[in-house]
Interface confidence: low
Amino acid sequence: TCEIVTLDRDSSQPRRTIARQTARCACRKGQIAGTTRARPACVDARIIKTKQWCDMLPCLEGEGCDLLINRSGWTCTQPGGRIKTTTVS
């Protein structure tokens, strides 16, 4: 399971699902924190190791996932053509 942790924000505020957040995940053995359907999730550690990011199903329902060159991240493409790029540091 994962919970969203807000960075630099008053803890009394509702947890905002915004860019300036990280996820704290309690994952089973062989899993690691990742992204599924644009939400933090526990994913197979092999996906992270091999950088096959799209295998996490990181994009929203109905979007297309593509690996960035050199597997530095992925893009999610909406049916309308707009693209959101995520890079992994």
């Epitope: 509702p14 905002r16 915004i18 860019a19 644009a38 109905g62 909406q78 049916p79």
Partner: antibody, heavy 121, light 112 residues
Framework: QEQLVESGGRLVTPGTPLTLSCTAS????????MSWVRQAPGKGLEWIGI?????STDYASWAKGRFTISKTSTTVDLKITTPTTEDTATYFC?????????????????WGPGTLVTVSL | ELVMTQTPPSLSASVGETVRIRCLAS??????ISWYQQKPGKPPTLLIY???NLESGVPPRFSGSGSGSDYTLTIGGVQAEDAATYYC??????????????FGAGTNVEIK
């Protein structure tokens, strides 16, 4: 050309449920997030709610219980559960672009022309 | 609940002037703002999304700026056809209660 058209607007008496429909041409509704927005005569725009490809929904706090958004394979529908005179407005359906949630901006890139609902005794 | 305070409610400008419309969000919305133009009897049309991105087909005299909770739509060198009502739309998503979108009250722009 990508277009939306709303239908179902008419004169109803208070308390009579009314369902509006939104159909698309040039793209498939099923792959998109869709929203309903309304505008009372001479007033501003009010966001009612959103429906996701999965069929799950979110509503403005004032709209919860007053409206139900649903979808079929070809339409996105808005049910006004118990109309009052305050619900007299033009109702627009709009396609959601951007990304809903998790730090993504959300906006409407295609709007229908609207359908007028009049609630009167 | 997110509140978008839009100012001014109305303004009058001459052709060629620069017009600025401001929207102040009740909290940081991290560039989750878009701007729309609406003419009488017509649906709104998208001008700017993500605070500063110009929608395709929109004249470059329209621009958006801002960050945090404070955003501005600028029309540089306003034209007669820009007479309309302009709305901002702010959006946030809460992990507990989902997506919430709120429009500003609108700004009616009259061209002298």
């Amino acid at each position: 050309q990508e277009q939306l058209v709303e239908s179902g607007g008419r004169l109803v008496t208070p308390g009579t449920p009314l369902t509006l429909s939104c159909t698309a041409s040039g793209f498939f509704l099923s792959g998109y997030y869709m929203s309903w927005v309304r505008q009372a005569p001479g007033k501003g725009l009010e966001w009612i709610g959103i429906i996701y490809p999965s069929g799950s929904t979110d509503y403005a706090s004032w709209a919860k219980g007053r409206f139900t958004i649903s979808k079929t394979s070809t339409t996105v529908d808005l049910k006004i559960t118990t109309p009052t005179t305050e619900d007299t407005a033009t109702y627009f359906c709009a396609r959601v672009a951007g990304y809903v949630g998790y730090g993504y901006e959300t906006f409407f890139d295609i709007w229908g022309p609207g359908t007028l609902v009049t609630v009167s005794l | 609940e997110l509140v978008m305070t839009q100012t001014p409610p109305s303004l009058s400008a001459s052709v060629g002037e620069t017009v600025r419309i401001r929207c102040l969000a009740s909290e940081d919305i991290y560039s989750g703002i878009s701007w729309y133009q609406q003419k009488p009897g017509k649906p709104p049309t998208l001008l700017i999304y993500g605070a500063s991105n110009l929608e395709s087909g929109v004249p470059p005299r329209f621009s958006g700026s801002g960050s945090g909770s404070d955003y501005t739509l600028t029309i540089g060198g306003v034209q007669a056809e820009d007479a309309a009502t302009y709305y901002c739309l702010g959006g946030v998503t809460y992990s507990s209660t989902g997506t919430h979108l709120t429009f500003g009250a609108g700004t009616n722009v009259e061209i002298k």
